[in-house]
């Protein structure tokens, strides 16, 4: 069961896996959740009754029964990992810890104007896990405003001590706030010859890359495939680092693959969720249980539902044995990866899907698209919403996109003349406008947040957020779209679609069925030539065919320009403005979402 509350003055007895240092019990719970085996923890807060060397210790624990005996102890705070919970989990920690020195390996010392600047520096430095900043009130004059960037093997401090007039905090890479490049390519026949910080077994290079991404010290990796000549190294995933942050040497070697940590794009790409099945593959590890199961899918479900299960191997039933049920071996290991991978034994293996909730919901694969045609089908664009106004009568006003369970991203120009959020209704999971009746459920709008630099669509900043009154429960027909990574600014998107219920030509009416059109992106230089009377800024993005014919139009405003990249859909643009609709040499102009990621995160993650 999911227990989220913390138990004050309580200590769990036994079951220790390891001890780390965390600045708070809340963060200890997050560390426990991300640890492959931790189910419970005990944190020691600072207290006069406690030995200062034990302050801020976070003891990670495991138990076969999923619980441990409780003992009363002043200053101890205990709790359970969120592994047992179904809600979305994030490692993002924006808290600033006052008067705490989080110790680690200081590898960079420089002057910064503020703690925020120091944190930004940490976020944009490939090695940085956390920082300590000496404030203007720090007793040592010479050390005031010094920003120390730190890292450790575990990503958590090696010790935490009290220190007046300093503040500490963590890198915001896991909050999607890093400007570091996001390199998704996997390089075949390549070995990166740098120092290994760890090695695990993985079934393929993609899993290896995902493991590298959530390993605190891994910056890039090399994976030896099952055809690798040296048998003892087959399926070996080497996690690597270097001082520069980049591989120093690339060696051409057949049957090896290499790539980079996806740390700076992890909010828009799955990094915890290994959903594939590996046929004719056996995963070895500590056996948790052996259960009968009808299929490998059923076996994966059993593993996902068993909180301690990390991976499984399913052996299909022999002919008519056991009512056609095979054996499902539920397994675990110290690091969450198989201890050995064997091929050719007929097993089907895979991983728990329990960790999928640590990934952004927007990375979930949606059902295959219908190729051709202009009318969409149900569930094809599950992030698309229709925004209605009820004044003076109810009608479709604009499109919008679900980007979080309480947030819709749309265009600012939609709210011209809208006096209050009370007159707005957001409908999700809608294909046809005719589905919307008096009793159709909708989301009320709690708040309209318009970019404070917005004046008119043509001059930019045409972006707005709607905070919903209630949260969206994600289903196949209503789920979020990923925001583009700031590290993806140089990605060239080739599979982009504009969707909406808007006009199909300039003098027309709102369409009943959600329309879609595949549209190529146009460079800003090209776009500027087509709009000589306007300034096409880097905060705008253009799309359209030279000959015209396909475009967004009236009523599509605020809706998404969705681009698929590496199997994940990204909200690249917001339909904003254009000259006419689908006119020759007049591309549509969209708000360039990547340039507003900081603004979006600032508004949506505000406490």
């Amino acid at each position: 069961e999911c227990v989220t509350q913390l138990l004050k003055d309580t200590c769990f007895e036994g079951g220790d896996i390891t001890t780390v240092f965390t600045p708070s019990a809340k963060y200890c719970q997050v560390v426990c959740t991300y640890h492959p085996r931790c189910l419970l923890f005990t944190f020691t807060a600072e207290s006069p009754s406690e030995d200062p060397t034990r302050w801020f210790t976070c003891v990670l624990k495991d138990s076969v029964t999923e619980t441990l005996p409780r003992v009363n102890r002043t200053a101890a705070i205990s709790g359970y990992s969120f592994k047992q919970c179904s809600h979305q989990i994030s490692a993002c920690n924006k808290d600033i810890y006052v008067d705490l020195d989080m110790k680690g390996i200081n590898y960079n010392s420089s002057v910064a104007k503020s703690a925020q600047e120091c944190q930004e520096r940490c976020t944009d430095d490939v090695h940085c896990h956390f920082f300590t900043y000496a404030t203007r009130q720090f007793p040592s004059l010479e050390h005031r405003n010094i920003c120390l960037l730190k890292h450790t093997q575990t990503g958590t401090p090696t010790r935490i001590t009290k220190l007046d007039k300093v503040v500490s905090g963590f890198s915001l890479k896991s909050c999607a706030l890093s400007n570091l490049a996001c390199i998704r390519d996997i390089f075949p026949n390549t070995v990166f010859a740098d120092s290994n910080i760890d090695s695990v077994m993985a079934p393929d290079a993609f899993v290896c890359g995902r493991i590298c991404t959530h390993h605190p010290g891994c910056l890039f990796f090399t994976f030896f495939s099952q055809e690798w000549p040296k048998e003892s190294q087959r399926n070996l995933c080497l996690l690597k680092t270097s001082e520069s942050g980049l591989p120093s040497t690339r060696i051409k070697k057949s049957k090896a693959l290499s790539g980079f940590s996806l740390q700076s794009c992890r909010h828009s790409i799955p990094v915890f969720c290994h959903s594939s099945f590996y046929h004719d593959t056996d995963f070895l590890g500590e056996e948790l249980d052996i259960v009968a199961a009808k299929s490998h899918e059923a076996c994966q479900k059993l593993c996902t539902n068993a909180v301690r299960c990390q991976f499984f191997t399913y052996t299909p039933a022999q002919a008519s044995c056991n009512e056609g049920k095979g054996k499902c071996y539920l397994k675990l290991s110290s690091n969450g990866s198989p201890t050995k991978i064997l091929h050719g034994r007929g097993g089907i293996s895979g991983y728990t899907l329990r960790l999928c909730k640590m990934d952004n919901e927007c990375t979930t694969k949606i059902k295959p698209r219908i190729v051709g045609g202009t009318a969409s089908v149900r569930g094809e664009w599950p992030w698309q919403v229709t925004l209605h106004t009820t004044s003076p009568t109810q009608r479709h006003l604009c499109g919008g996109s679900i980007i979080g369970n309480q947030w819709i991203l749309t265009a600012a120009h939609c709210f011209y003349g809208v006096e209050s959020p009370k007159i707005l209704r957001v409908y999700s999971g809608i294909l046809n406008q005719s589905e919307i009746k008096e009793d159709t459920s909708f989301f009320g709008v709690q708040e309209i947040i318009i970019h404070d630099q917005y004046k008119m669509a043509e001059s930019g900043y045409d972006i707005a957020l709607l905070k919903l009154e209630t949260t969206v429960n994600y289903t196949d027909s209503q789920r979020p779209i990923c925001l583009p990574s700031k590290g993806d600014r140089n990605v060239i998107y080739t599979d982009c679609w504009v969707t909406g219920w808007g006009y199909r030509k300039l003098r027309d009416k709102i369409q009943n069925t959600l329309q879609k059109a595949k549209i190529p992106l146009v460079t800003n230089e090209e776009c500027q030539k087509r709009y000589r009377g306007h300034k096409i800024t880097h905060k705008m993005i253009c799309a359209g065919y030279r000959e015209g014919g396909k475009d967004a139009c009236k009523g599509d405003s605020g809706g998404p320009l969705s681009c698929k990249h590496n199997e994940v859909w990204h909200l690249v643009g917001i339909t904003s403005w254009g000259e006419g609709c689908a006119q020759r040499e007049r591309p549509g102009v969209y708000t360039n979402v990547v340039e507003y990621v900081d603004w979006i995160l600032e508004k949506t993650q505000a406490v």
Partner: antibody
């Protein structure tokens, strides 16, 4: 683990330049300041100067014209040069790591005698 | 430059006694004062930094207090292994400077 090790010439002639190197391990010079401190035989500690993580330097006012501290981050080495030495510069020379102005780790020191 | 005047220059006390050493700065140094212990033939060892923070592994019989210009270092119960020279140091403003030292002996 954190270690600092001084290495010096042992004996230096008057008016020459004294050069000592401090080689560190277990931490990076880009993240920590390094101090030089000396102790004449039977006397107290004297602060000579420091080099910060970002390369800035600070020196003892009385020795400023004669002291130079530099470093090579890639080699994890900090060097102290003291020019125009006299017998008064005979001392044990220590390098130490900065922790907010205090010195949390010290080398074992190297003895330098100035004599002709 | 800031001068640190340490007193006494030497003291003799019995095992278990409370020992106090003082340090006076020539100008305000906030709370940026450290205390070191040096045993014969060894490098100094950091005991206290920023007036009152004990370094890792330092026994709690060692403590420090003060602010501005007047600082005190205390050994609450002198032990035989505490025989050493103790130095204060201001780390408020460069050039940093040490006190002249206090030699602690057992009676």
């Amino acid at each position: 683990q954190v270690q600092l090790q001084e290495s010096g010439p042992g004996l230096v002639k008057p008016s020459e330049t004294l050069s000592i190197t401090c080689t560190v391990s277990g931490f990076s010079l880009t993240g920590y300041g390094i101090y030089w401190v000396r102790q004449p035989p039977g006397k107290g500690l004297e602060w000579l100067g420091m080099i910060w993580g970002d390369g800035r330097t600070d020196y003892n006012s009385a020795l400023k014209s004669r002291v130079t501290i530099s470093k090579d981050n890639s080699k994890s080495q900090v060097s102290l040069k003291l020019s125009s030495v006299t017998a008064a510069d005979t001392a044990r020379y220590y390098c130490a790591r900065d922790y907010y102005g205090s010195k949390d780790y010290w080398g074992q020191g190297t003895t330098v005698t100035v004599s002709s | 430059d800031i001068q640190m005047t340490q007193s006494p220059s030497s003291l003799s006390a019995s095992v278990g006694d409370r020992v106090t050493i003082t340090c006076k700065a020539s100008q305000d140094v906030s709370t940026a004062v450290a205390w070191y212990q040096q045993k014969p033939g060894k490098a100094p060892k950091l005991l206290i930094y920023l007036t009152s923070y004990r370094n890792t592994g330092v026994p709690d019989r060692f403590s420090g207090s003060g602010s501005g210009t007047d600082f005190t270092f205390t050994i609450s119960s002198l032990q035989p292994e505490d025989i050493a020279v103790y130095y204060c140091q201001q780390h408020y403003k460069t050039p940093y400077s040490f006190g002249g030292g206090t030699k602690v002996e057992i009676k």
